[in-house]
Interface confidence: low
């Protein structure tokens, strides 16, 4: 395995090494003494949800009782690289991304839960674990072989203002309908209580006399 | 559900052999690491010898190296101890547990054999099997 990381060391000076010149306190101070490579383990392939949401677990073996751990996300395609999102924690506490980060996760233990939010098809790609434990020294550095992560982008609805047309449509036809029916059953209604009557009127004399005036019956005589 | 189950101890005079047996079901072998731990009365329990079982990496105690050899059966599951020259000072309940190889350095020297021989690492135990070492 290639060495992913470097042992930090610091110098620990007596009277006899404080004579020494500068550059080599220089070296001892920066130059990696040991390497150690820190394995990183993560899922080959996730599919996200249609919603856009991939979710993995990044696990790492820790070699010692790291206190401060920070996870990086990176995206590889092709032979390009780009960071999606960072976290530094503190072992027991929650992983804390930027606000305008797509990232959200919660650690435990060796095993941090990555969550990647507003995925398109797009954003199809490997995407590597990077974990390093920052404190206390010494610093290691492992990364995960990555994960593949699939992003179908769901079917375009139809249009809403065309489904608002056929809605209006419908309810339309329907109080129309319900009008037309009203007023029919109300027509029926009424013609059933009115009398039936010709349209023919002929005048008849009244029951009782009134003002003692009399009406003779007369006769059209018709040729 | 993980089970490891040991198996072979006894009583055997100093100078004689034994061998463990370690039976694992509930997961494979793959990928894992499994440890084997003894325990005396009133001391703590100490890291005997260690095989990862994808590489077949081991591990061993420095009490123990030239005397104890770890081994591993694929098809049957099984990790090995065999243990010869044996010493009264060898007498303890012997465990066998198991860790996944993620939890473990990946990479051995440097310091990184102590995480496979500390019991804190692993995270299955079986229920141990009794050893004494006595004439």
């Known amino acids: 395995m290639a060495c992913l990381g470097f042992q930090r060391h610091k110098a620990q000076l007596n009277l006899a090494t404080r004579t020494w010149p500068c550059t080599l306190l220089f070296f001892l101070l920066f130059i990696p003494v040991f390497c150690k490579a820190m394995h990183v383990a993560q899922p080959a392939v996730v599919l996200a949800s249609s919603r856009g949401i991939a979710s993995f677990v990044c696990e790492y073996a820790s070699p010692g009782k790291a206190t401060e751990v920070r996870v990086t996300v990176l995206r590889q395609a092709d032979s390009q690289v780009t960071e999606v999102c960072a976290a530094t924690y503190m072992m027991g506490n929650e992983l804390t991304f930027l606000d305008d980060s797509i990232c959200t996760g919660t650690s435990s233990g060796n095993q941090v839960n990555l969550t990647i939010q507003g995925l398109r098809a797009m954003d199809t790609g490997l995407y590597i674990c990077k974990v390093e434990l920052m404190y206390p020294p010494p610093y290691y550095l492992g990364i995960g072989n990555g994960t593949q992560i699939y992003v179908i982008d769901p079917e375009p609805c139809p249009d809403s203002d065309f489904l608002l047309w056929i809605l209006a449509a419908v309810s339309s036809g329907l109080f129309f309908y319900s009008f037309l029916l009203t007023a029919v059953s109300l027509s029926k209604m009424l013609k059933k209580r009115s009398p039936l009557t010709t349209g023919v009127y002929v005048k008849m004399p009244p029951t009782e006399p009134e003002c003692e005036k009399q009406f003779q019956p007369y006769f059209i005589p018709i040729n | 559900e993980v089970q490891l189950v040991e198996s072979g101890g006894g009583l055997v005079q100093p100078g004689g052999s034994l061998r463990l047996s370690c039976a694992a079901s509930?997961?494979?072998?793959?990928?894992?690491?499994i440890g084997w731990f003894r325990q005396a009365p009133g001391k703590e329990r100490e890291g005997v010898s260690c095989?990862?079982?994808?590489?077949?990496?081991?591990y061993y105690a420095d009490s123990v190296k030239g005397r104890f050899t770890i081994a591993r059966d694929y098809a049957k599951n099984t990790v090995y101890l065999q243990m010869n020259s044996l010493k009264p000072e060898d007498t303890a309940v012997y465990y066998c547990a198991a860790v996944h190889g993620l939890k473990l350095p990946s990479q051995r020297g440097l310091g990184g054999s102590y995480y496979y021989l500390l019991a804190r690492s692993y995270d299955y135990w079986g229920q141990g099997t009794q050893v004494t070492v006595s004439s």
């Open positions: 509930g997961f494979t072998l793959d990928y894992y690491a």
């Open positions: 095989i990862t079982i994808s590489d077949g990496d081991t």
